[in-house]
């Protein structure tokens, strides 16, 4: 029978044994930085090359007994999960192992850095096909380890890491907190976050997605044909490394940004029970469980977007938060969110030649998040058009006036502490899709993009208050690029995109005592690329 | 040569105390620093430390990903090391664990 985890990552309508061919991932090399491994285990023999790299600290304790099978346990299991002949994800992927963890599973930041440097030098000396680096380890937040991961990622290497097993915010750990790394949390057979003793999988905005990580059957170093079940975010990361190898083998030219977007796009959505996460982390944690794409052929015709949350701004009056897209992604819209509702909106601004999304805290606010919508839009030319506060009763509006530019997102930002709920609601005049409309005391920012074949439309869903949440989704074939609230008044906590749905959250009116019957409207901008669709059809 | 004006090198260490490994430090140099400059900076640190009666050991010189070096030394020398030319920041080594 097929292990639950391989069944889970197989797309619907396929059988795992049919879907995972013996040569899957064969064009890809996966580097594993872990313990020593038993490379002649039947699951992985001939698939794993043990490099001569070793940089580990001495084991703790005077009575430590170095038993080979224990020393090899973690790494052997993970190598089996990635490429094992029976229980592996990418059965055709070849692997190279570096020993950076000792027999107790402990290593150092410096040893890991030297290991990453070794990989980079190997890549320069003998360039091969796509490289995936699996880092099934975690330490405290490390600026230098994150920086090294960033450099390696910018050299075209895909890094996949464990989110950590501390039932904590993954942003407090490295390399999990490195934005360029694909950070993986763990779920179980019931699609619940994995509990590990008193702890469990990490969570939060630094996690990219989850993958099976409990009771995972894989190679055991106890004997050359033994199997064992292990659990942890390492096992989850190994699944994603295997899926990445499969995807890169099918499309070797994929960039890191394209691969990450595909991993997110093909994941199972909204299956994780978020109640397991601390309340303040639920909105930040992606509800995604990794899966293989339904076809080994590319999905190049899709317009892929993902949501990137900033770190929390902190509570000071002038505090801001910045969310950034990856280097080869376009920022198509920017929104903000505050649990207290005290915020001064958000704006898109240039920083180092690239657009970023900045959210502003308000006096008495507990802090804000900036939320960027980051998309893959080849040959795009995007700019931000701003209208200052109109002060007129009809509100502030701005549109994309350049020929061929379409509206992909709207933001609003205000200097006053409270826009007030008594102002008349501002509704968008119909038939003007290329226009952002906002409160008269707010500056309005429109993201306007020109890209071959790009077309966008505005979708709205308004319901009278009191209503804690209003949503509007883009239909099949369209991708959500922009998500904002109308009007941007103070009882609106903010707006953010979850997959292809725009979510607008408002304060619970029963607690605020407000009697305003003001309607809250969720405004989604949905786009698609005819150009990408045509290019894909021509290839097929 | 002194560090460039207005760019003070910073010191970082693990927020989780039991995971800290004091006595080993990663000295990260500014982005465009060449290997020869990294080696020179490491030697300079050793020389200045020796003049103060401290023994240091260069464990590794980084190049390829980040310019810098790994050094075994007393924490007393951090102030001195932060003032070296080309230094961007220094991070105390720390533990990582299988997950």
């Amino acid at each position: 029978s097929i292990p639950w985890n391989l069944e889970r990552i197989t797309p619907p309508r396929y059988r795992a044994d049919e879907y995972q061919p013996p040569d899957g991932g064969s064009l890809v090399e996966v580097y594993l930085l872990d313990t020593s491994i038993q490379s002649d285990h039947r699951e992985i023999e001939g698939r794993v090359m043990v490099t001569d790299f070793e940089n580990v600290p001495e084991e703790d304790g005077t009575r430590f007994h170095r038993q080979a099978s224990k020393c090899d346990s973690h790494g052997t299991h993970l190598a089996g999960v990635v490429s094992g002949r029976d229980a592996g994800v990418a059965k055709g992927a070849s692997m190279r192992s570096l020993r950076v963890l000792n027999c107790q599973g402990k290593g150092t930041v410096s040893g890991t850095l030297i290991g990453l440097e070794f990989i980079r030098k190997s890549q320069l000396v003998q360039p091969v096909g796509p490289l995936v680096v699996l880092l099934p380890l975690a330490g405290g937040y490390s600026r230098v380890l994150n920086a090294a991961c960033q450099r390696l990622a910018r050299a075209g290497v895909v890094l996949v890491t464990a989110a950590g097993n501390f039932r904590d915010d993954a942003c407090l750990y490295s390399p999990a907190s490195a934005p360029e790394v694909i950070t993986v949390g763990a779920t179980n057979a019931q699609d619940q976050p994995v509990t590990l003793g008193t702890l469990g999988t990490n969570f939060g905005r630094c996690v990219d997605l989850f993958a099976p990580g409990e009771d995972i059957i894989g190679a055991s170093s106890d004997c050359s044909t033994c199997f064992v079940s292990q659990s942890g975010t390492s096992q989850a990361a190994a699944h994603v490394a295997g899926i990445a190898a499969m995807m890169l083998s099918a499309e070797p030219e994929l960039t890191l940004a394209e691969l990450r977007q595909r991993l997110i796009h093909f994941s199972a959505k909204d299956v994780i029970n978020e109640a397991w996460f601390p309340e303040d982390q639920r909105v930040l944690t992606p509800n995604l469980v990794a899966a293989l794409p339904p076809s080994t052929h590319g999905a190049g015709w899709q317009l892929f977007c993902r949501t990137v949350w900033s770190a929390h701004s902190g509570p000071t009056r002038m505090a801001t938060a910045i969310a950034r897209c990856a280097p080869d992604e376009e920022l198509l819209s920017c929104s903000s969110f505050s649990r207290s509702g005290k915020r001064r909106g958000e704006r898109m601004e240039a920083q180092g030649g690239k657009l970023v999304c900045r959210a502003h805290n308000a006096f008495g606010g507990e802090g804000v998040y900036a939320i960027a919508r980051c998309c893959l839009l080849p040959q795009a030319n995007c700019s931000v058009h701003t209208a200052p506060p109109a002060e007129a009763s009809m509100g502030t509006r701005v549109h994309c006036h350049q020929q061929g530019h379409v509206l992909t997102g709207c933001s609003s930002h205000w200097e006053v502490e409270d826009l007030g709920t008594h102002k008349p609601p501002v509704l968008r005049p119909r038939g003007q899709p290329n226009q952002c409309v906002g409160h008269r005391e707010a500056s309005i920012h429109a993201s306007c993009c020109h890209a071959p074949g790009l077309e966008c439309k505005v979708k709205e869903h308004g319901i009278p208050a009191p209503q804690e949440q209003v949503t509007v989704a883009c239909e099949e074939g369209w991708t959500l690029t922009g998500c904002s609230a109308l009007p941007g008044t103070s009882h609106v906590l903010g707006a953010y995109a979850v997959d292809n749905t725009c979510v607008v959250r408002s304060r619970d009116v029963s607690t605020t005592g407000s009697t305003s019957e003001e309607a809250v409207t969720a405004v989604a901008i949905c786009c698609r690329s005819r150009h990408l669709a045509q290019a894909s059809q021509e290839l097929q | 040569e002194a560090p460039e004006h207005g760019t003070t090198a910073t010191f970082h260490r693990c927020a989780k105390d039991p995971w800290r490994l004091p006595g080993t430090y990663v000295v990260v140099l500014k982005e465009e620093t060449h290997l020869s400059q990294s080696e020179r900076t490491a030697r300079r640190l050793q020389a200045q430390a020796a003049r103060r009666g401290y023994l240091t050991k260069i464990l590794h010189v980084f190049h390829g990903l980040l310019p810098g070096f790994l050094v075994k030394m007393s924490g007393d020398l951090l102030e001195l090391a932060l003032k070296l030319p080309h230094v961007d920041y220094i991070e105390e080594d720390s533990s990582v664990f299988a997950q």
């Epitope: 038993q38 002649d40 023999e45 001939g46 080979a68 099978s69 002949r85 004997c223 | -």
Partner: antibody, heavy 115, light 107 residues
Framework: QVQLVQSGAEVKKPGASVKVSCKAS????????ISWVRQAPGQGLEWMGW????????NYAQKLQGRGTMTTDPSTSTAYMELRSLRSDDTAVYYC????????WGQGTTVTVSS | DIQMTQSPSSLSASVGDRVTITCRAS??????LDWYQQKPGKAPKLLIY???TRPSGVPSRFSGSGSGTDFTLTISSLQPEDFATYYC?????????FGQGTKVEIK
């Protein structure tokens, strides 16, 4: 290139022991164990067991019933298969092969058990 | 142990013929089936692994197919050097077990 070179033919009396060697070269030893397979005259192939160069672990076919011992000496890149209490039906060509996949084979060692 | 049954046990064919040998497992072995070629006085040589994958250096006239319990080795156009005995071997379980062999002779 990758190759396995076995020791020469042996003639043994019933009850005696034989030790066949297999020297591996051209690949990283630790990445593969060595399988031993035998073929009686005019018969098919029979897997006898597997031994690790990495840690000396073994995996024997039940039929050997404790009569066989497989070992490795990584320092000389050599694997050994010893068969004790030889019987006439142990007369066969003994092959070593790389790993469980058995993708590379030695040239074979003929062991004749005869009184 | 898993039993492997090959058919036919021998066959006569001419150069250029298309030859098919079948192998049946006593239980499902997924795609874990290998084919070997053995010439008199020589060691077996791996021809096909994982039911259908050809190692580098094996001519493309050799192909394998099947999954579960039924497998086939096909030689699309028999060459003089292909006259030999062919063995199938299951690689699903330990111990690996071989078929009894199919001898391909010159007609």
């Amino acid at each position: 290139q990758v190759q396995l070179v076995q020791s020469g033919a042996e003639v043994k009396k019933p009850g005696a022991s034989v030790k066949v060697s297999c020297k591996a070269s051209g690949y990283t030893l630790n990445n593969y164990g060595i399988s031993w397979v035998r073929q009686a005259p005019g018969q098919g192939l029979e897997w006898m067991g597997w031994v690790s160069f990495y840690n000396g672990n073994t995996n024997y076919a039940q039929k050997l019933q404790g009569r066989g011992t497989m070992t490795t000496d990584p320092s000389t890149s050599t694997a050994y298969m010893e068969l004790r209490s030889l019987r006439s039906d142990d007369t066969a060509v003994y092959y070593c092969a790389r790993g469980y996949v058995m993708d590379i084979w030695g040239q074979g060692t003929t062991v004749t058990v005869s009184s | 142990d898993i039993q492997m049954t090959q058919s036919p046990s021998s066959l006569s064919a001419s150069v250029g013929d298309r030859v098919t040998i079948t192998c049946r497992a006593s239980q499902s072995i997924n795609n874990w089936l290998d084919w070997y070629q053995q010439k008199p006085g020589k060691a077996p040589k791996l021809l096909i692994y994982a039911a259908s994958t050809r190692p580098s250096g094996v001519p493309s006239r050799f192909s394998g197919s099947g999954s579960g319990t039924d497998f086939t080795l096909t030689i699309s156009s028999l060459q003089p050097e292909d006259f030999a005995t062919y063995y199938c071997q299951q690689d699903q379980d330990i111990p690996p077990t071989f078929g009894q062999g199919t001898k391909v002779e010159i007609k």
